[in-house]
Amino acid sequence: GCLTQLYENAFFRGGDVASMYTPNAQYCQMRCTFHPRCLLFSFLPASSINDMEKRFGCFLKDSVTGTLPKVHRTGAVSGHSLKQCGHQISACHRDIYKGVDMRGVNFNVSKVSSVEECQKRCTSNIRCQFFSYATQTFHKAEYRNNCLLKYSPGGTPTAIKVLSNVESGFSLKPCALSEIGCHMNIFQHLAFSDVDVARVLTPDAFVCRTICTYHPNCLFFTFYTNVWKIESQRNVCLLKTSESGTPSSSTPQENTISGYSLLTCKRTLPEPCHSKIYPGVDFGGEELNVTFVKGVNVCQETCTKMIRCQFFTYSLLPEDCKEEKCKCFLRLSMDGSPTRIAYGTQGSSGYSLRLCNTGDNSVCTTKTSTRIVGGTNSSWGEWPWQVSLQVKLTAQRHLCGGSLIGHQWVLTAAHCFDGLPLQDVWRIYSGILNLSDITKDTPFSQIKEIIIHQNYKVSEGNHDIALIKLQAPLNYTEFQKPICLPSKGDTSTIYTNCWVTGWGFSKEKGEIQNILQKVNIPLVTNEECQKRYQDYKITQRMVCAGYKEGGKDACKGDSGGPLVCKHNGMWRLVGITSWGEGCARREQPGVYTKVAEYMDWILEKTQSSDGKAQMQSPA
């Protein structure tokens, strides 16, 4: 299953399959997730080790048993790959690292005014993988405001150095934010020239293209079909690059197919997995396990559930079957691709779905009255769980926020439905940033069911929570995916990085905003919060957030939206915007429904009609 916990001051001994430099544990975890063999990782922050060569070291590890012995190492961080973690699987990494220089091949230098502008340039440059920016206070004046665009053979820095007044980060192309755009065309009977960066075996050009998209240095590819004249080159997928970023030449060639990486696509990237099943095809590789199952789909599910399994072959040979069950061969290789592909067999083959974003139909939980005042504009894909709840009567208007917690579920505030309990009048917009982008042609979700907490009473602040079941499930993308829920009764976690988002008023007597706003707000203890509300009881089912001096807060139109906190690199839905005394007033924190206190209720209500829980229970 999906294991998200991180181990502080621990290092996994042995099992090394690769090593690299990464700026933090979360990026190391992402590299582990996308590495075909990596199940575990250990990361050494600069503070944890004196050996300069090992600082920022990210060690990717495999283990037949799925675990390795942990040794104590002060400052080290270890954890698991996020394979099998559904929508948490993403190659997108937005963080900017201050005081850190990520080294690589510097291929472009320009003057820019901010680190964000530098990141944008990297994202809009086809070859840029990461960048460094020298701030205005950098010690050498001639380098100030320099934006260095970089790449490396592995897509990660060749070294990472602590350096004052330098900020580094990665391209946001994996976040589907590139302005370059992409070529979706597949070119039949055409071979591209240039430099081969890798060679793998794939059953078709589409798998080849997806592998190219997620390979750090692949810009385009050529695939040799199973009827290619040279037998040893059949099903070979050549991943390619060039100085210019495009093929310098192409040659008409029978039984070849070429195309481009889709990493520069805007707003949508292919999933990093291959779901198609190939009848009459055998995939060769190292045997992991053989099991008898009923049908090829069950074989694929079995492979997906066995975390080390990369691909499978389901044999229909009479000697491999008994009654209705046949042998399911679970296999793996060094690079995640079959070592041999044979056609015209009595088998069916395919890949593990362990890297599919959609995962199962579950909602992520973790193993362990009120626009935003004083906020700033959000960017695309920054808060992909945020939805706008709009009412269409004579006109249409935004009324509340909400959080996507599953393919078919939105969590919001009960008071959003005060006086408007009819599901037909509501329209739910997901995957949007600007309300002005909504036109009559913009797709929206309709409500199948509104589930208001049974103890909620109109005009009272208690139990201000409601679930919305959508009429049709939503697909997950970089711009539309769920937020993880906390564990039941989560009281031990100390959250220090919390944000509230919404399109609500920017002042007490204001108006709905066009661009989704965000504001970083500290949590306030319930005891402190209670002292500031002389007439209202702050219960253990509420959480408060706000600045002593005021100035930043949620406001009218933000209700029902998320209060999210980042902990161990993962965002969790800590609160639902509920109520407050005015907006952003001094000494009057905003009050939010504490989601952890309602986990039993959420899990109970989101049971599907067949009784199968539609979300993973928290550990």
Epitope: N462, Q530, K531, R532, Q534, D535, K537, I538
Partner: antibody
Framework: EVQLQQSGAELVKPGASVRLSCTAS????????IFWVKQRPKQGLEWIGR????????KYDPKIQGKATLTADTSSNTAYLQLSSLTSEDSAIYYC?????????WGQGTLVSVSA | DIQMTQSPSAMSASVGDRVTITCEAS??????IAWYQQKPGKAPKLLIY???TLQSGVPSRFSGSGSGTDFTFTISSLQPEDIATYYC????????FGQGTKVEIK
């Protein structure tokens, strides 16, 4: 309209116990805290304790602990103050009050006279 | 335990006068002080909380100020209906009242 109706005056003997009631209307006591405050004749105000009727959690002034017991019955929307081992020092007006961080609305008070 | 020392214990002033009452806490109470008015035979009424926030419906002639351990309650222009005893209350750590100040008309 928010109201707290307290029980009538009590004349009790030293060493005895008494239970005072505070019935709420216009709101649900589960949604608030109920506080109790003592005022001796011609004297100031003293906080006795607080109850959260939703879960019966209580907090008392350490000086008063043992003398007073706070309870609540949410079905009748009523809070109670039980005073035990009464002495002349306990002769006072006892107020119930509702609120969050502090006492926002008060009952009319109940006079308790301890006399042989 | 936090002690609240309120002064004066009693005072008389004329209608229209500015009246000031002070309260000193034995420890820093983080501005968590409230002021109550109690008229004879009546229950106390909340006037001000969190040092200076006026409870809704309370006339603006009542105000509060201070920080740390020293706090002041002011009636900018005394009215006949303001004749009462005024109490400060700290609510930073449990609850402690001051001894009260009885305000009379000269």
């Amino acid at each position: 309209e928010v109201q707290l109706q307290q029980s009538g005056a009590e004349l009790v003997k030293p060493g005895a116990s008494v239970r005072l009631s505070c019935t709420a209307s216009g709101f649900n006591i589960k949604d608030t805290y109920i506080f109790w405050v003592k005022q001796r004749p011609k004297q100031g105000l003293e906080w006795i304790g607080r109850i959260d009727p939703e879960n019966d959690n209580t907090k008392y002034d350490p000086k008063i602990q043992g003398k007073a017991t706070l309870t609540a019955d949410t079905s009748s929307n009523t809070a109670y103050l039980q005073l035990s081992s009464l002495t002349s020092e306990d002769s006072a007006i006892y107020y119930c009050a509702k609120g969050g961080g502090l006492f926002a609305y008060w009952g009319q008070g109940t006079l308790v006279s301890v006399s042989a | 335990d936090i002690q609240m020392t309120q002064s004066p214990s009693a005072m008389s002033a004329s209608v229209g006068d500015r009246v000031t009452i002070t309260c000193e806490a034995s420890h820093d109470i983080n501005n968590y002080i409230a002021w109550y008015q109690q008229k004879p035979g009546k229950a106390p009424k909340l006037l001000i909380y969190y040092t200076s926030t006026l409870q809704s419906g309370v006339p603006s002639r009542f105000s509060g100020s201070g920080s740390g351990t020293d706090f002041t309650f002011t009636i900018s222009s005394l009215q006949p209906e303001d004749i009462a005893t005024y109490y400060c209350l700290q609510y930073d750590n449990l609850f402690t009242f001051g001894q009260g100040t009885k305000v009379e008309i000269k």
